[in-house]
Interface confidence: low
C-alpha cells in the first residue's frame, strides 16, 4: 500500500475549492489541524477540514445526490408527463369530435330533432369526458338517459309530427315505453357495452400514466437520510481534507454506497416492472370495442342505426304506444321524412379502420416500447448514478472513503468502515414511508390493470351482435356495429389523422412542468459544479 502523498502544508488548495462551496474562508484552517472534532472524515493525521466544513460537505453531498437522481429520471419523467398530456388532450378531442359527428348526423338526417337532440348529445358527451377523468358516473345510466331523452322527441317529431299540443304531456310515459317496448332494439345495450368497456380501459390507462408520474415525482424528491449524507460525504469530499484534490472515488466503492443510499428506492423495482408489463397488456387489448377512439367516433353511426330501427317499426310502435300512453287526440301517421343515405358504406368503413390503425393505438404502442426501455430503471439506479458521477476507471488508484488505494477491495473497505458506519444497518432500515405508500399505489394499479386487460384469445364479445337484432341490423362482419354510414365519414378520417399529428406537434415547452427542463448534458454540468470536479 503506497504512502499517501504529503499533505498540502498550507491547506491552500482546500481553501480555494471550499471558497466555491461557501464564500468566506473562516471555516478553513490555515494549516492542517488534528481534526479531533470531525465525525465523518475521520483523520489519520493532520487534516484541512473543520467540523463546519464537514457539515457543509454533507449538505452539498445530499443536494448533489438529489440532483443526480432527478437527472437520472428526467428522460423517463418527461416521457410519461408528455404522453399523459398528449393522451388526455387527444381523448378530449375524440370526445369533442364524437359529439360533433353525432350532432352533424342529427342535423343532416333528422333536422326536426334539433336543437333538443343537440342538448341531449351534449350532456351525454359531457358525462363521457367526466367519466374518463375519474368521475363516479354509471355508463349504463348515461346511455339510458340519452335514449330516454331522445325517444319522446323522435316520437313527437318523426313518428307523430301531427300530434296536437294537448297531447304533448306524454313525455314521461314515452320515456318508460322506450325501455318496456325496447323501441331501439338492442342498440342501447350494444352502446352500453361498447362505451363502458372502451371508457373503463381509457380511464384506467390515464390513471396508470398519472400514477407513473407520481411514482417518478416521489422518488425524484426523496430526501436522503443523514446516514446516506455521511457516506456520500466520505466518498466525494473526505479526500479533500487530506489535500487529495485530484483523486476519484473507486467505482466499486461508489456502487456499495449508492446501493446503501438507495436500498429503499430499489424496492420499487419489482412493482415498477409489473406496472410496465401490465400497462403493455392493457394497451395490447385496446382495440375495437376496447378502444374509445374507435367506439366514440363510430357512435353517431350506431345512434343513427338505432333511429332507423325505430323508423322501421314506427307503425307498430305508434299503435302500441297510442294504447299504452292513451292520449285522446292521437293522430297515427308516420313521418314522411326518410333520409336516403342511412346505410353503412362498407368501403368507407374499412378505410376508416385502416386510418385508425395509424393513430392513437400506434402512439400507445410506441409509448409502451419506450417505457419498456426503462423497465430496469429502479434496479439500475445505483449503477446509473455511479456511471454519471466522477469515479476512477478500473478501480485503480482511487479513494475508498478512507485513503488512496491502488485497487479497491470491498472487504478491506468494509473492515475499515466498521467503526465509522455500518452499511448493513442502512439496508435493514427498510424503505421510507413515502416509498411504501407509492409501492402500495403501484400494487393497486397493477391489480386494476390486470383486471382490465382483455383476456388472451378473446377478441370480441360476439354474442353482442347476435342478440335480438332484427333484419340484419348488425352484421357479423361489421365490427360490432362500430363504423358508419357515408354521412360524416370523411370528417372522421381527417380527424383521425389530426389526432395522430397532435402527439407530435407538442413541443417540450408545451408539457406542464417541463418549461425549465434541462438537457441531460446541462444537468450533469449543474450536478457536478458543486463537486469541484477538477479531475
Amino acid at each position: 500500500q503506497p504512502p499517501p502523498p504529503p499533505p498540502d502544508a498550507t491547506c491552500h488548495q482546500v481553501r480555494s475549492f471550499f471558497q466555491r462551496l461557501q464564500p468566506g474562508l473562516k471555516w478553513v484552517p490555515e494549516t492542517p489541524v488534528p481534526g479531533s472534532d470531525l465525525q465523518v472524515c475521520l483523520p489519520k493525521g493532520p487534516t484541512c477540514c473543520s467540523r463546519k466544513m464537514e457539515e457543509k460537505y454533507q449538505l452539498t453531498a445530499r443536494l448533489n445526490m438529489e440532483q443526480l437522481l432527478q437527472s437520472a429520471s428526467m428522460e423517463l419523467k418527461f416521457l410519461i408527463i408528455q404522453n399523459a398530456a398528449v393522451f388526455q388532450e387527444a381523448f378530449e378531442i375524440v370526445v369533442r369530435h364524437a359529439k360533433n359527428y353525432t350532432n352533424a348526423m342529427f342535423k343532416n338526417n333528422y333536422p326536426s330533432l334539433t336543437p333538443q337532440a343537440f342538448e341531449f348529445v351534449g350532456e351525454f358527451f359531457t358525462d363521457v369526458s367526466l367519466y374518463i377523468l375519474g368521475s363516479d358516473i354509471n355508463v349504463d345510466d348515461m346511455v339510458n338517459e340519452l335514449f330516454d331523452s331522445l325517444f319522446p322527441v323522435i316520437y313527437t317529431q318523426l313518428m307523430n309530427p301531427g300530434l296536437p299540443d294537448s297531447a304533448l304531456d306524454i313525455n314521461e310515459c314515452l320515456r318508460g315505453a322506450r325501455r318496456d317496448l325496447k323501441v331501439f332494439g338492442n342498440f342501447p345495450k350494444l352502446i352500453m357495452t361498447q362505451v363502458s368497456k372502451s371508457l373503463q380501459v381509457t380511464r384506467i390507462f390515464l390513471q396508470a400514466l398519472n400514477l407513473g408520474i407520481e411514482v417518478i415525482n416521489t422518488t425524484d424528491h426523496l430526501k436522503f437520510s443523514k446516514d446516506c449524507g455521511r457516506m456520500l460525504t466520505r466518498m466525494w469530499y473526505c479526500s479533500y481534507c487530506q489535500g487529495l484534490m485530484m483523486v476519484k472515488p473507486c467505482g466499486g466503492y461508489c456502487n456499495v454506497v449508492m446501493q446503501g443510499c438507495m436500498a429503499g428506492v430499489v424496492e420499487i423495482d419489482k412493482y415498477w416492472r409489473e406496472y410496465i408489463l401490465s400497462l403493455e397488456e392493457l394497451v395490447n387489448g385496446m382495440y375495437r370495442i376496447y378502444d374509445m377512439e374507435n367506439v366514440l367516433l363510430g357512435l353517431f353511426s350506431t345512434i343513427h342505426d338505432s333511429i332507423q330501427y325505430v323508423q322501421k317499426n314506427a307503425g307498430k310502435l305508434t299503435t302500441t304506444i297510442g294504447k299504452l300512453c292513451a292520449h285522446s287526440q292521437q293522430r297515427q301517421y308516420r313521418s314522411a321524412y326518410y333520409p336516403e343515405d342511412l346505410f353503412i358504406d362498407k368501403k368507407v368503413l374499412k378505410v376508416a379502420h385502416v386510418e385508425h390503425e395509424e393513430t392513437l393505438s400506434s402512439r400507445r404502442r410506441e409509448l409502451i416500447q419506450k417505457l419498456k426501455s426503462f423497465i430496469s430503471f429502479y434496479s439500475a439506479l445505483p449503477g446509473y448514478i455511479c456511471s454519471h458521477s466522477p469515479v476512477a476507471e478500473n478501480d485503480t488508484l482511487c479513494w475508498n472513503g478512507q485513503e488512496l488505494v491502488e485497487r479497491y477491495s470491498q472487504k478491506a473497505a468494509r473492515n475499515g468502515m466498521k467503526n465509522q458506519f455500518n452499511l448493513h444497518e442502512l439496508k435493514m432500515k427498510g424503505p421510507e414511508p413515502v416509498v411504501s405508500q407509492i409501492i402500495d399505489k403501484l400494487k393497486h394499479i397493477n391489480q386494476l390493470l390486470r383486471t382490465m386487460s382483455v383476456p388472451k384469445g378473446r377478441v370480441l364479445d360476439k354474442n353482442l351482435d347476435e342478440e335480438g337484432f332484427e333484419s340484419g341490423d348488425c352484421g357479423d362482419d361489421e365490427d360490432e356495429c362500430i363504423g358508419g354510414s357515408g354521412d360524416g365519414m370523411m370528417k372522421v378520417k381527417n380527424q383521425l389523422r389530426f389526432l395522430a399529428e397532435l402527439a407530435y406537434d407538442l413541443d417540450v415547452d408545451d408539457v406542464p412542468g417541463n418549461n425549465q427542463q434541462a438537457t441531460p448534458k446541462d444537468n450533469e454540468i449543474s450536478t457536478f459544479h458543486n463537486l469541484g470536479n477538477v479531475h
Epitope: A85, N103, A104, F118, F498, D505
Partner: antibody, heavy 120, light 107 residues
Amino acid sequence: EVQLVESGGGLVQPGGSLRLSCAASGFTFSGFGMNWVRQAPGKGLEWVSYTSSSSRTIYYADSVKGRFTISRDNAQNSLYLQMNSLRDEDTAVYYCARDSSGWYDAFDIWGQGTMVTVSS
Amino acid sequence: DIQLTQSPSFLSASVGDRVTITCRASQDISSYLAWYQQEPGKAPKLLIYATSTLQSGVPSRFSGSGSGTEFTLTITSLQPEDFATYYCQQLNSYPWTFGQGTKVEIK
C-alpha cells in the same frame, strides 16, 4: 361584456421583433381555444395561429411557422403573439379571436385589431 | 391546404334585393364552414357556423346552406347595414382558411 382588446402593434424594421397581446374579459378565458388572424391592407383574412385552452395543442400557418410563437397566460386572461424575423409581407392588422365552445368551430368573438407595419 | 373560392368577388345590389354568395372548397369539408361579415375599418363578425346555424343575435334574413364542397350564403332582403365584405372559412382541417371575400356594394 365579452371583449378582446389587442395591443403591441407598431412600426418595426424587417428582421425585427414585436410582441402582441390580447386582453380578454367578460368570459372564462381558460375554457376557450384562441386564435390570431391577420389582414393585410386592402386584402382578405388570413388565419395565423391557434392555441388550445391548455396550450398543449398549437398550430401555425405555414407562412409564420418558425418565426411566430403563440402563448397564453390563463391566470392573466391574456393571449400573446411573439413575432420574430419580421418581413414586409407581415404588415397587417392583427386580430385575436375566440374559438367558439359549441359543437362546431367558429371564431365567435373578435378584438378590434392592432396594426403592425414592417418597413425600413 | 384547402382552398376556398368565393363568387362573385364584387356584387352591386339595392336595398330589399335577395343576394346569394357562393363558396367552393377544393375538397370535401362536410359542414365545417362559417360565414363572417366585415364592415370597413371594423373587425369581422360571425354570422353563420356549421354551414347553416345562425349565430345568436344575427338577423334571420341571413341563411346558409350546402355541404361537401359547395356552400351559399343568402341575404333575403338586403338592408343598408348589410353593405360589407363577406368571408367564408373552412374549419374542417388545419390550416384553417378563408375565402378571398365578396364585397357587397350599393348599386
